[in-house]
Each structure stands twice: as C-alpha cells, then as structure tokens.
C-alpha cells in the first residue's frame, strides 16, 4: 500500500466533517492493483484541501453561524479512483461505529474494561469526492450509516435518483441539463452528423446516454459513439482517434462528455498523430477552461467550445492562498510535496525533501506565479456552507435559546442531518441561491467556452455565452469571426429542386444520396417521387402537376 | 484519374510548381500525398495537404516544399532545389479525408535539377 | 522520428515458390500498414491495406498479416508477373515522420 494514501489532514472540532479530494490523480492501468497514486493536483487536490481548511476557519469566526460549537475536518485522498476513495471511506466509516451506548471518546475493551484511548470524533457528514463513479461507490457505503454526502463536482444523472442515493446532495445540477446545453449548440450551428466520444465510467456514461437521447429527438445523428478510461494508455487513444478519422469530412464535430484527463489524452493523441485541427472538440464541464487540460497541447484544442458551471473566482481564497509557503504551513499534510512539484525544486531539510529535484528551492518562490484557481472553488467552498447551515438550523431546531451542542444533538443523527440539509437556503459564495430540490439538485447555469488563439503562441478561454434554464445565448461572432468560417458537420448536403433523399440501408437518417425524379415524376415528399396522372405534368418548380393544356390540331399547323 | 504536370529541367536554387489535376475526385473529401522516386531508389513520402486543407511534411521537408490545392489541382511548389531533389514526383490520393492508404496513383511527372 | 525498415532489401524466388518478406515500424502502429508493388516505369499499385485486407483486383495468393511494429507479406505460388519491388507503409501518423515508405524489397522471379 502506497504511504502518500495514508496521510490524513485533520482540523479538530466540536463537530468532525469528512472531506474527500483528489489530491494526487489516479492511478495509471498498470498501478490500478496496487492503488499507487499519481502525481500531486493542484486545482483539484491542494486547492480543494485548502479551500476546506480555511472556509472551516471562516465558518468558526462567524458568530452567526453555528455560535459556540467549532467544525473540524478530515480530508482523505480519493485518487479520482473508486477503490482509492473506498477505503477512505471505510477509515470514515470507521470513526462513525462507536456504539451510541458508549460514553463519547471511550473505547470498551473486549473484557469490558474501559480504555484511556480517546477515540477519534465521528464524522458527521462528507464533502465530495469530485467524479461521479467516485462519488456513486462512496454513497452506497455512507448511506448504509446514514451519513449524508454533498458533492462539488459530480454531476452524474443517476445521483439524483434518491431511492438509490438517499444521503446523496450536491450544490451542482445534474447532467441531463449540460446535455441539453451541449444539443443545444450543436443545433444552433446545423451540425446534423457528430461523433461522439465520453470517459468511461458514470459522469461520461449517463451524459452521453442523455446526449444521444436528445439529439436523437432534434434530428442529429451520430455518426458512432465511442468510449474510453481517462487514465487508458497512448495506443488507446491513437486507435480512438484513427477511427474518429474514418469518419472525416463528414462529422468534423465530436462531442465529448469526458472528464478533462480523457479530453487530454485526445489531445495528445493528435499531436502524434498529426491531427490538430482536423475536429472541433465539443466538451462537457470535465473540461470547461482548465489550462491543465490544454496545456502543451494548445493548437490541438483551438476550437474547443466547451461548457463550465457557473462559479465566478472566489476571491478571498486567493488572498489565503497565495500567501501559503512550506515552512509555515503545517496543517495541509501534502502541501510540501505539492510545493516541491509545483516548482520542481527541492526543499532541503524538511520532512518530505523529494531527491528527485537536483535544483534547491529557493525562497522567492511564490503561489502567485501561473496562479489559476480550480474552477469549481465556489462549489467546494457552498458544499461546506450547505453542511455548516444544516448544522446550523438542526441546532437551531433541537436546542431552541441553547448556544453549542444540546444533548439533544448528541450524537448527532444523520437522518435528522439530512431532513436539515435538504431544507438548507442561503446565499452562495458569489451571491447566487443555493437550495436543493427533491432530489438534493442544485439548479442549473452554464458558461459557454470557447479556446481560442489570442496572439502568437497565446491561447486563452473565451466566454461566448451562457444556457440558462433551457435558454442558450452565444455570441457567433466571437466564436467564428465571420459567417464563411463555422465549421461544418453534416453527412449529406440537402437535395437540389426535383431530387429526392434515398437513405441506403443501414445508414443513418442524416445520410443519403440525391436522386433526380423522373421526367412525367414531381417531388411527393422528401423521400418520394410520383408520377403525374395521365394528362398532367410537373410543374416548373416539380412540387406538384398541372393539367396539360388540350391543344386541336387544324389540318393546315405546322409539324410540332 | 490524377495527372501530374509541371515536371522539367530546372537549375539548382530555382524555384519549381508542379501540379496534380484532379477528375473525378472531390478534393474536399480526401487527403492527397505527394512522393518522389529518384532514378533507381526507393518511394520517398514529400507530404500530405488533408481534405481539411491542413498540410504535413516529412522531416526532411524543413520548408523546401509547399503543398497547396484548389478545387481541381494539387500544386507541390519546390524552392531553391539541388541536384538531390531530381526524381519522378507522383502525387495519390488517400483512401481517407487525412491519413491511412494511397489508393490511387498519377503516372508521374520527371524533375531533372541540373545547372 | 518515425520510420519503416524492410528486409530482405532484394530476394530471389523460383516460379511456383512462397516468398515472405518483413516490415518492421520504429514505433506500434496497430494495422496501419499497407503494402504496395511497383514493376519499372510505373507508378506504385496498392495490394494490400491495414495489414491484412487485400486490395480490389489483387489475386488471393497475396497475403499481408502482424500487427503493432511487425509485419509480413506473403506471395504464394509466386508468377513471373510478381517480378516487381515491393514497398510497405504506415498508414498511422504524419507527425515527426522521417518517411512513411519502408526501403523496399526487390522481387527477382527465376
């Protein structure tokens, strides 16, 4: 088992609240067995542990929020990886099994003796993990000890079913309205013949499903659908590529509901194999603006339209952030790790010194150099709020005039918690109103991205517009520049005047061949030419017939 | 059917266009590549202009060759040639919108680099 | 860089015989492979596509097979009219390409 796993932050509290980022990334297919992790994230990992760490700090210095009781935290590394995040998980579990009998902190021993050992607080409720397929494994253990789970990022369709994920919350909508979005701007440029890729696993799974399923009803047709592990090797997305190729010019667009590691390896796979340029990417929030996406592989992505959840910058977390260096931050477990990463440097003489770095990290360095904060930061940051709230107004409830924790909330019931929790309303970290309805969903507001070349050698995300509760803006201009450029994706062009459509067998609706009717035939309907009754005869524009005009013949006219 | 053209003697440091005229071929659905065979030696693959327009070339290219089509023709422009470039230049057409198979090919044209 | 080696760079084979020949990719290239015969004065003819699939008007004695970096072709009850060299391609990238062609094997018919 690999050491970096075990490490735990801690934040000690009246109230303990678990939280699971990915604070290194998951494993590769050939480290799958043994759960050796990956490399340390900033935007997703070390951001996010930050991000609780000091929303925690704010939390218990606000006098009006939760007054007299202090929230603590346990943050474990899920790996963006199902088994990884389980076993957290289990450790989680097991603060929570201490028998309600039992004085708070005392471990009974076998011989009913008691022990000094002050066992750990259990935790009331957990913050996260980010992925779907994650965040799905992780509810079917907590529900089973009715411990109420609020995810930032997983935004899976099937997490609203509450038959299945009880315990289940998110400040996040779900996925069958970026579907929507994602047809939506595919409709609104006539792409009618699209590939369609997604990241194996639930988020790209059920979006995909969704997107095809709508598309279907608009008209557009796929032309295969092809899916693939984010963490699969190089081979794997050159092969997935090479048959994207196969279906050129025809579909130039490929949808993609993938989390951002698949949409990179895309990426890279272009690269080798000289593809750039050759698809437009259409990409689901998995990928939204992340420069860790695009970065080294920009003229691949150039095009890219891309949707990302609403969530302005928080910008009191940038100044906490910025601030933070190795030698005074010794709370955040994985930070000098992170640190020597980052910089690809050495700290010499502290405890995690990595000797892969020849260089010395010197004490100029700062957070602020390519800072970019993760772009779900407002949802981390509204999760904890959603839990401290729902703290609150339980406490509020079961000890009326009683400042901190009444009996009555001891230990604290994770079925009461979760009633609590649903019934949360406040105002989010930017403003905006954050409730769940009946399925513990947040409502839906989406950016539309575009990844443009700003200059030479400088690309950048552009905001193009926006989908709102079914409505979708775009700015074309920004996007295409001018009428003549938006690309085209369509199987067949439309039939001239006095042409049918013949789709051959097998193929789908968007594809067919133009056939011109025959001479005494007009154009029935789009499928089907018939001919005119004896004594008529197509009209000039051949959508109907017109009687023959009977013409006499006197013996002294000319030959016709 | 392709057809190159253009081919001739041309002296070293010249610049030279030849082109491949296209019938019968919708040049924005398929890839087309250019390769050269010099006087008993091997194919050697110029490059690739892709249906999308977008162009590839061989390392040892370093911008000595351009490849640029319209509608009906393929052009290959060749800049500052040396005696190494004489050779019949072929151009075929892909099996696909970018890269995969040549499926048909032009009789080609003879570029002879002499001073 | 990408390249294609091909051995034997020249063979000898008898009317009737098998003759094999081997292209080998600096790097996996799936069944993105293609062989293709080229008689003097003429240009390239395609027999063989993406490994193994034979070309439209190719006799079946042609046979192409491997995958990733190793391939063959086959030609079986080999004819006078098989006097020709062979070349083979990768059909996978044009990305740091030094040449897509391999060297190419030169058949002699005795």
């Known amino acids: 088992q690999s050491s970096e796993r075990r490490v735990v932050a801690h934040m000690p509290g009246d109230i303990i609240i678990g939280a699971l980022f990915s604070v290194h990334h998951q494993p590769t297919v050939d480290k799958v067995h043994e759960r050796k992790c990956g490399a340390v994230r900033e935007q997703y990992g070390i951001q996010r542990v930050e991000a609780m760490l000091h929303t925690l700090e704010r939390i218990n210095s606000d006098p009006t929020l939760l007054p007299n009781i202090t929230l603590g935290c346990e943050i474990r590394d899920s790996c963006w990886h199902s088994a990884v995040a389980l076993e957290q998980s289990i450790e989680f579990i097991r603060d929570s099994l201490i028998s309600s009998e039992e004085e708070e902190g005392l471990v009974r021993c076998v011989d009913g003796s008691s022990s000094s050992f002050r066992s750990k607080k259990p935790i009331v409720g957990v913050i996260g993990p980010g992925s779907s397929s994650v965040a799905i494994q992780v509810q079917n253990l907590l529900q089973l000890f009715n411990i109420p789970q609020i995810a930032y990022s997983a935004t899976s369709m099937d997490l609203s079913d509450k038959t299945l994920f009880k315990y289940f919350m998110r400040v996040v909508p779900s996925d069958a309205q970026q579907a929507r979005a994602m047809v939506d701007i595919v409709k609104r440029y006539n792409w009618t013949y699209v590939s369609a890729v997604h990241t194996e696993g639930n988020y790209g799974e059920s979006g995909m499903e969704a997107f095809k399923d709508m598309s279907a009803k608009e008209g557009i047709c796929i032309a295969h659908s092809y899916k693939i592990y984010s963490n699969a090797g190089e081979q794997s997305f050159d092969k997935l590529l090479k048959k994207l190729t196969s279906h050129l010019p025809k579909a130039r667009v490929v949808a993609c509901f993938c989390e951002g590691m698949t949409v990179r390896g895309l990426l890279m796979a272009m690269r080798r194999l000289g593809l750039a340029g050759e698809f437009l990417l259409l990409g689901s929030d998995g990928w939204a603006d992340r420069y860790d996406v695009t970065d080294g592989y920009q003229r691949e992505a150039v095009g890219g339209i891309t949707i990302k959840l609403q969530s302005p910058d928080v910008k009191w977390f940038d100044d906490y952030y910025l601030k933070l260096r190795p030698e005074t931050n010794h709370r955040n477990p994985w930070f000098q790790e992170f640190w020597q990463h980052r910089f690809q440097c050495r700290l010499e003489g502290f405890p995690q010194e990595n000797s892969k770095y020849n260089k010395t990290c010197n004490s100029s360095l700062t957070l602020k150099t390519h800072h970019v904060q993760d772009s779900k930061m407002g949802f981390v940051i509204n999760a904890i709020y959603s839990m401290a709230y729902g703290l609150h107004n339980m406490q509020m409830s079961l000890c009326p005039g009683y400042a901190g924790l009444c009996d009555a909330m001891k230990p604290i019931d994770g079925r009461k918690l979760l009633e609590s929790l649903m019934k949360t309303n406040f105002t989010g970290v930017s403003g905006d109103t954050i409730l769940f309805d009946e399925n513990g969903d947040s409502p839906g507001r989406y950016e539309i991205m575009n990844f443009k070349e700003m200059g030479k050698d400088y690309f950048d995300y552009i905001n193009v517009g926006s989908w709102d509760n079914g409505e979708l803006k775009m700015d074309d201009d920004e996007v295409w520049s001018k009428k003549s450029n938006i690309i085209r994706s369509v199987c067949s062009e439309p039939c001239e005047k006095g042409q049918i459509k013949v789709i051959r067998k097998g193929e789908v609706s968007c594809c067919w061949t133009c056939t011109p009717c025959k001479e005494n035939e007009y154009v029935f309907d789009e499928y089907t030419c018939k001919a005119c009754q004896l004594g008529s005869w197509p009209t000039d524009d051949l959508t109907g017939c017109d009687l023959i005009p009977v013409q006499y013949l006197r013996w002294g006219d000319p030959e016709p | 059917s392709l057809e190159e053209s253009g081919g001739r003697l041309v002296t070293p440091g010249g610049t030279l266009t030849l082109t491949c005229t296209v019938s019968?071929?919708?040049?924005?659905?398929?890839?087309m590549s250019w390769v050269r065979q010099a006087p008993g030696k091997g194919l050697e693959w110029i490059g690739i202009i892709y249906a999308s327009g977008n162009t590839w070339y061989a390392n040892w290219v370093k911008g000595r060759f351009t490849i640029s089509k319209t509608s009906t023709t393929v052009d290959l422009k060749m800049t500052s040639p040396t005696t190494e470039d004489t050779a019949t230049y072929f151009c075929?057409?892909?099996?696909?919108?970018?890269?995969?198979?040549?499926?048909?090919w032009g009789q080609g044209t003879l570029v002879t680099v002499s001073s | 860089a990408f390249h294609m080696t091909q051995t034997p760079a020249s063979m000898e084979v008898a009317v009737g015989g098998t003759v094999t020949m081997k292209c080998q990719a600096s790097?996996?290239?799936?069944?993105?492979l293609n062989w293709y015969q080229q008689k003097p004065g003429q240009p390239p003819k395609l027999l063989i596509y993406q490994a193994s699939k034979l070309a439209s008007g190719v006799p079946s004695r042609f046979k192409g097979s491997g995958s990733g970096t190793e391939f063959t072709l086959t030609i079986s009850g080999v004819e006078c009219a098989d006097a020709a060299t062979y070349y083979c391609?990768?059909?996978?990238?044009?990305?740091?390409?030094?040449?897509?062609f391999g060297g190419g094997t030169e058949v002699v018919v005795k």
């Open positions: 391609q990768q059909g996978w990238s044009t990305n740091d390409v030094d040449n897509v």
């Open positions: 019968g071929i919708d040049l924005s659905s398929y890839a």
């Open positions: 790097e996996s290239i799936d069944t993105y």
């Open positions: 075929a057409r892909d099996s696909s919108a970018t890269f995969n198979y040549l499926d048909l």
